[in-house]
């Protein structure tokens, strides 16, 4: 499954297309792959119309989920399994994947893992959580891999495209923003460049591609000459106040 990067505590993952439905309709919760919320025409989808994601194995679900039938015991209707929320510490489990990151399944109970150097919820800005990547952690350990960024690369300010943790790691005129599988230094936006208009507080953590903010004296507004039927699919650009 697609790599998912934990950006901050506001990150909401696994907002998939409805069962049997095609993704991409405006106003629906859309995910191009388990674990990744995507930006459809600059319209950020929210939990308001959450739909379960069908799956065959745990790997198809996000870090905070596991694959199982929705009803206890027997498989769901027609044997359908969906991604279910992971189980917290001290909850019952049958395998590691059922437990939330930082925990593992021991004697049927989710227990804290010794491998988890960063307690969940702490210093989340300082880790990149790689899910479903091709370079697997030790087989069967049941934990998402967490990789910290090497401190030695921060002696000089990051140039465009270099990895970063926060904007202060980047050179002037750049900000630290998510770019598919990583966070890199990107240029602050200039007039006319595509920007992202966030519909609600905290939504910046949802994007698989983050853009920097518009530069001084500019605001992110709907492109005036962008004639499209639906407001939701219009591009926003940085425009003079």
């Amino acid at each position: 499954t697609l790599n998912s990067v934990l950006i901050n505590s506001n990150a909401i993952k696994n907002l998939p297309p409805p069962l049997g439905g095609a993704g991409g309709q405006p106003g629906s919760a859309v995910s191009v792959a388990p674990g990744v919320l995507y930006e459809g025409g600059n319209k950020y989808q929210t939990l308001d119309n959450y739909q379960p994601y069908p799956c065959a194995e745990d790997e198809e679900c996000g870090s905070d989920e596991y694959c199982s039938s929705p009803s206890r015991g027997a498989a769901g209707v027609g044997g359908v399994q969906i991604c279910l929320a992971c189980r917290k510490r001290r909850k019952r489990c049958m395998r590691h994947a059922m437990c939330c990151p930082g925990n593992y399944c021991k004697n049927g109970i989710c227990m804290p893992s010794d491998h988890s150097h960063f307690p969940r919820g702490e210093i989340e800005e300082s880790i990149i959580e790689n899910l479903g990547n091709d370079h697997n952690a030790a087989a069967g350990d049941g934990y998402p891999r967490r990789t910290t960024l090497t401190s030695k690369i921060y002696h000089t300010k990051g140039q465009e495209g270099s990895v970063c943790l926060r904007s202060s790691d980047c050179a002037a005129g750049l900000c630290c923003a998510r770019h598919f599988w990583s966070k890199i230094c990107k240029p602050v936006l200039k007039e006319g460049q595509v920007c992202t208009k966030h519909k609600r507080k905290g939504s910046h953590g949802l994007e698989i591609f983050q853009r920097c903010y518009c530069g001084e004296g500019l605001a992110c507004r709907i492109q005036k000459d962008h004639h499209q039927a639906s407001n939701s699919s219009r591009l926003h650009t940085c425009q003079r106040h």
Epitope: G23, G24, T147, T150, W181
Partner: antibody, heavy 118, light 112 residues
Amino acid sequence: QVQLVESGGGLVQPGGSLRLSCAASGFTFSSYWMSWVRQAPGKGLEWVSVIEHKDKGGTTYYAASVKGRFTISRDNSKNTLYLQMNSLRAEDTAVYYCARHGIDFDHWGQGTLVTVSS
Amino acid sequence: DIALTQPASVSGSPGQSITISCTGTSSDLGGYNYVSWYQQHPGKAPKLMIYDVNNRPSGVSNRFSGSKSGNTASLTISGLQAEDEADYYCQSYASGNTKVVFGGGTKLTVLG
């Protein structure tokens, strides 16, 4: 300035192996993800693999067409990117480019030709 | 197999404007407001011309511009010049196994 120089290409028989290298200079190599992209003769570009900035235990991704046969790696102390290619097939014949994956493929090498033929 | 669809060729006269289209699906190009364009002259390495839909890297002429609507992205070159004659490739990201996808390429011919 940023420079990427590939080497290691050549003629190899089907089923054989080859290891490509890419020497990087002019930028902080250890701060960038790096990729391999290939181009079959007269054809378009095809992404092959990408590796995280870290050289030990870093994340890697592969195109479905090479997964299980190719291995990407890097040595940050030598500013070098590698591509180990095993079980080569005729369809792997291409110019292999090493590319810096900053904001997309912002710098490319000149490429090295790999020919798989009996 | 090509994930993004581009016209095989386009042509224009010096001074004219041309547009190259790139069509994908909701799983790749349509799924993200994100696309890049590369220029490749014969026997040379590709060069990044546009990223993030319509952003130009430093050193790229402002005659090159990008846009995107739905599942289709476009590269427009205004004031065509002889040196613009090259192959152009779009690139996006995708869900599933292949994380990076390219278009099949478009050969731009500058007439005259």
